[in-house]
């Protein structure tokens, strides 16, 4: 499975969105976990409402925020206030009773804000203002690599 | 009317190849998962494996893995399970049947096919 | 690999009587993930039960569900000559999708 790599300046936020297929997945509940090294598990950090119809509501931990919409078959996951410590591996998951299915990897690179360096005076940005999606916006990029880290539930 | 039906009974010889199938009419055959199930003479259900015919995502039960093939044909809404080896304890029935969905849920296995009798003798 | 025991193995009922079948997974299974089935000889299995406990199209109601997490029970209120075949249960909670070995219903 293809590894994507986002990359989002810290202090500001990181959206992900995750594509599917909205039939083969119906019903499923989806989540957004940390791998934990190449071999290791896969952490739930959020998944969806339990309510699989209720899933277009926003579900909260912590900073990450996570949000489906099942007929468009896109999850997108947003990691708001981004730090350093959030670099690392991620999947987004499909629930099915005990199994959780990978729909995508997610490689999340935390680039320091060189602004943090400076005095930057009226500069500043609200958080909820900056907002990065993927490859979208011109400071967040996006690519795809090859790695041989095994899906994990 | 949303139906599976099988193709017809096989009498084949060990060693031999086989493969059956299971046509569905009356639904949308991409979006729904099809799934295979065993039945020997005089016993129970045993799961075998389950594809979905849009994208033939396959899984299998680790009983059967190795041992069949389990396929699908979306141009033709057909799905198949063959042997290239078969044994005598292959003799049995075997039925397809669809795996229903609802809106946050499962439905089990909610369309059957009629089964498709296999008997392998010398 | 979650393994489903049925009991008892024969139910020997007369009609009108009340059956009571029973389900047990090794591990704990998610009730929308558990789903009852009636064969009669020589045919193909017919989806009873849902989600544990929510009625098939066509299914009357004299057939319910009940249980969660290891224990699922099937009754039938009251028995109709046309009831009396082998009943499976069977969890889609974790692949293998595994079926118990089937309560046969006869007739005392």
């Known amino acids: 499975l293809n590894t994507t790599v986002l990359q989002g300046m810290a202090g500001q936020s990181l959206r992900v969105s995750c594509t599917y297929d909205a039939l083969k997945h119906w019903g499923r509940r989806k989540a957004w976990c940390r791998q934990l090294g190449e071999e290791g598990p896969c952490q739930r950090v959020v998944s969806t409402h339990g309510v699989w119809l209720l899933a277009f509501l926003k579900k909260r931990n912590g900073s990450t925020v996570i949000a489906d919409d099942t007929l468009a078959g896109t999850v997108t996951i947003t990691l708001k206030n981004l730090q350093a410590g959030d670099a690392g591996l991620y999947q987004c998951q499909s629930l099915r009773g005990r199994e959780a299915e990978v729909l995508q990897k997610v490689l999340v690179e935390v680039l320091e804000d060189p602004l943090d360096d400076q005095d930057a005076g009226d500069l500043w940005v609200p958080e909820e203002s900056s907002s990065f999606e993927g490859a979208q916006v011109e400071h967040s990029t996006s690519r795809n690599q090859e790695t041989s880290f095994p899906p994990t539930s | 009317e949303v139906q599976l039906v099988q193709s017809g009974a096989e009498v084949k010889k060990p060693g031999e190849s086989l493969k059956i199938s299971c046509k569905g009419s009356g639904y949308s055959f991409t979006t729904y998962w099809i799934g295979w199930v065993r039945q020997m003479p005089g016993k129970g259900l045993e799961w075998m494996g389950i594809i979905y015919p849009g994208d033939s995502d396959t899984r299998y039960s680790p009983s059967f893995q190795g041992q069949v093939t389990i396929s699908a044909d979306k141009s033709i809404s057909t799905a198949y399970l063959q042997w290239s080896s078969l044994k005598a304890s292959d003799t049995a029935m075997y039925y397809c049947?669809?795996?229903?969905?609802?809106?946050?849920?499962?439905?089990?296995?909610?369309?059957w096919g009629q089964g498709t009798t296999v008997t392998v003798s010398s | 690999e979650i393994v489903m025991t049925q009991s008892p193995g024969t139910l020997s009922l007369s009609p009108g009587e009340r059956a009571t079948l029973s389900c047990r997974a090794s591990q704990s299974v998610s009730s929308s993930y558990l789903a009852w089935y009636q064969q009669k000889p020589g045919q193909a299995p017919r989806l009873l039960i849902y989600?544990?406990?929510n009625r098939a199209t066509g299914i009357p109601d004299r057939f319910s569900g009940s249980g969660s997490g290891t224990d699922f029970t099937l009754t039938i209120s009251r028995l109709e000559p046309e009831d009396f075949a082998v009943y499976y249960c069977q969890q889609d909670d974790s692949a293998p999708y595994t079926f118990g070995g089937g309560t046969k219903v006869e007739i005392k």
């Open positions: 049947a669809r795996a229903g969905h609802y809106d946050g849920g499962h439905l089990g296995m909610d369309v």
């Open positions: 989600g544990a406990s």
